[in-house]
Amino acid sequence: APISSHCRLDKSNFQQPYITNRTFMLAKEASLADNNTDVRLIGEKLFHGVSMSERCYLMKQVLNFTLEEVLFPQSDRFQPYMQEVVPFLARLSNRLSTCHIEGDDLHIQRNVQKLKDTVKKLGESGEIKAIGELDLLFMSLRNACI
């Protein structure tokens, strides 16, 4: 089971109108550049076999991947939103740094790996898709971690 006290984000993180709006604007800008509408990265399949108490830990993994492998490499694009949203998401990642689960997390890593593989397979368009789904990342983090 997760060390649940550490797998928590305060509700106030998701109640800041300005940065929330910027996050959603960034997602919209990127989704307009996303031609591959047949693929969904963040959806029901991501959570398959993952209990409610493990979902924040899963979303931490997705957040970290999105920051390191998508947002940092694409940081020159989608300005001015990117320069504001990346530090916000990095702060959330930092707050989840002590979120771990005890025991086997193979089922979680398997699901996250599928997402990573899809992004990598699609190349730059996979990165654009991941940015276009930042609204879903935001909502999934909110639901899983508060």
Partner: antibody, heavy 119, light 107 residues
């Protein structure tokens, strides 16, 4: 082409039961959340229930909780609504609709099936 | 539950008019708002999702705006086919909830 076809509506007496079906085609049914929405004669739209693609999560409106069960058979591309302890206020056209996930709109709707609860 | 309040409930307009319908949520729903068009005896059709994205097949004269609690649907130049009832719907949280509808009539 996406198609959703509801069936099973009809006249039922108060306290009675009915099972509605929705046959889906033209898309990967198991990938989609499915919802039932109803519309009483001359009234607005009221969401009734939803079920996840796997069938593992279900959601209900307070007005029907305990009287209605949503289910699906992905092998048959079918959605169901089991209704019991029916009341006159349940009289409505019942639509099935699909939405990819939790944060997705209802992008396709069936034509609906009329349920009339009357003595 | 999130309450959705739509206004006006009835709207009379002429061909070529610019028409605006508003929808207010009882709490913040980010951009998780859809607009549907319904004609008598027919199922609703999706027009707008994520508050401002045009659904596939929806005419470009329809546009949506807003975020948080206040949203609008605009028809830039009313066409004969647009006389119908319009509903907003939030999908930020279950239970999904609809506005009461706006009936658009010919003046």
């Amino acid at each position: 082409e996406v198609q959703l076809v509801e069936s099973g509506g009809g006249l039922v007496t108060p306290g009675g039961s009915l099972r509605l079906s929705c046959a889906a085609s033209g898309f990967t049914f198991s990938d989609y959340y499915m919802s039932w929405i109803r519309q009483a004669p001359g009234r607005g739209l009221e969401w009734v229930s939803a079920i996840s693609g796997s069938g593992g999560s279900t959601y209900y409106a307070d007005s029907v909780k305990g009287r209605i069960t949503i289910s699906r058979d992905n092998a048959k591309n079918s959605l169901y609504l089991q209704m019991s302890s029916l009341r006159s206020e349940d009289t409505a056209v019942y639509y099935c609709a699909r939405g990819l996930w939790v944060w997705d709109p209802l992008d396709y709707w069936g034509r609906g099936t009329l349920v009339t609860v009357s003595s | 539950d999130i309450q959705m309040t739509q206004s006006p409930s009835t709207l009379s307009a002429s061909i070529g008019d610019r028409v605006t319908i508003t929808c207010r949520a009882s709490e913040g729903i980010y951009h998780w708002l859809a607009w549907y068009q319904q004609k008598p005896g027919k199922a609703p059709k999706l027009l707008i999702y994520k508050a401002s994205s045009l659904a596939s097949g929806a005419p470009s004269r329809f546009s949506g705006s807003g975020s948080g609690t206040d949203f609008t649907l605009t028809i830039s130049s009313l066409q004969p086919d647009d006389f119908a009832t319009y509903y907003c719907q939030q999908y930020s949280n279950y239970p999904l909830t609809f506005g009461g509808g706006t009936k658009l009539e010919i003046k």
